[in-house]
């Protein structure tokens, strides 16, 4: 089995306050199977962005097409960003389970917020 | 609520070709994945073909390849069936299906009979 | 090939299990389909292994571990008689499968 790596090419990504941002996260691997989700920020208060298995996530929008059957692309649109999005965005791959449980996660996206031009 | 609703079985000569239609409401169908089931006379569920949110992949099973072909218009929350030479062996009843984001079905249509004979 | 056994029977108010072998942990999520009479639309009872539909009764439940899943009722009611596919979908072949049906009796 190929291991699966979990790719956020983006370090960093900078947007102004009521644009969109788009934060990247490719998959290697559709194995083993189960969600993805993103999350603003890590440990006990972390905020779930998007999760796979469940929704609607109204300001959140998938990049590609995730109904896809062989997708390994879960980037993500945000709209309408303000400065409480500011933070640091992981993709995480959830293994299937009950509950499902996180077995990899991205090395994660920071978001920062600019001023919206006048 | 979601309503799934097939058309266009029948009685159609072994050769010949036939055309299913299912009409989605209830739902955001532009924003799901669709499938094929068929049910022979006596027998058990067989998944024939499905076809990804935006239309552009589609999957089928070996047997059906090549003769059947999966498509769908978002414009009309419709989804279709083109079957081409047909044998008796197609005779059964056919239903769409709607898929869960892991590619499993959560709704049914009634279903349609097409019966092959001479 | 999904295997199920072919019939069950039970009396109302026992639990039932009814399992389903042959997919693989890793690459294969399970659902369950109820069909009351032959050619009538199927309902999903189970979906993902585990998850009930909103509109279905809760003592319907399903797991899955290793390379099988099962589905319980709980206080099965004659109501539930009715045949019960398993289903899955591999990741590997992007392919769904069923396994023959399980009839459930209820005495």
């Known amino acids: 089995e190929e291991e699966l790596q979990i790719i956020q090419p983006d370090k960093s990504v900078s947007v102004a306050a009521g644009e969109s941002a788009i934060l990247h996260c490719t998959i290697t691997s559709l194995f083993p199977v189960g969600p993805i989700q993103w999350f603003r920020g890590a440990g006990p208060a972390r905020v779930l962005i998007y999760n796979q298995r469940q929704g609607p996530f109204p300001r959140v929008t998938t990049v590609s097409e995730t109904t896809k059957r062989e997708n390994m692309d879960f980037s993500i649109s945000i709209s309408n960003i303000t400065p409480a999005d500011a933070g640091t965005y992981y993709c995480i791959k959830f293994r299937k389970g009950s509950p499902d449980t996180e077995f990899k996660s991205g090395a994660g996206t920071e978001l920062s917020v600019r001023a919206k031009p006048s | 609520d979601v309503q799934l609703v097939e058309s266009g079985g029948g009685v159609v000569r072994p050769g010949e070709s036939l055309r299913l239609s299912c009409a989605a409401s209830?739902?955001?169908?532009?924003?799901?994945?669709m499938s094929w089931v068929r049910q022979a006379p006596g027998k058990g569920l067989e998944w024939l073909a499905g076809?990804?949110?935006?239309?552009?992949?589609?999957y089928y099973i070996d047997s059906v390849k090549g003769r059947f072909t999966i498509s769908r218009d978002n414009s009309k929350s419709s989804l279709y069936l083109r079957m081409n030479s047909l044998t008796a062996e197609d005779t059964a009843v056919y239903y769409c299906?709607?898929?869960?984001?892991?590619?499993?079905?959560?709704?049914w249509g009634l279903g349609t009979l097409v019966t092959v004979s001479s | 090939a999904l295997t199920q056994p072919a019939s069950v029977s039970a009396n109302p108010g026992e639990t039932v299990k009814i399992t389903c072998s042959g997919g693989d942990y890793y690459s294969t999520y399970y659902a369950w389909y109820q069909q009351k009479s032959p050619g009538s639309a199927p309902v999903t009872v189970i979906?993902?292994?585990?998850e009930r539909p909103s509109d279905i009764p809760s003592r319907f439940s399903g797991s899955a571990s290793g390379s099988a899943a099962t589905l319980i009722i709980t206080g099965v009611r004659v109501e539930d008689e009715a045949v019960y596919f398993c289903g899955g979908y591999d990741g590997r072949t992007y392919i769904n499968t069923f396994g023959a049906g399980t009839t459930l009796t209820v005495l």
């Open positions: 076809i990804s949110a935006g239309g552009s992949d589609t």
């Open positions: 979906h993902s292994d585990d």
């Open positions: 299906a709607r898929e869960t984001w892991n590619h499993l079905f959560d709704y």
């Open positions: 209830g739902f955001t169908f532009s924003s799901h994945a």
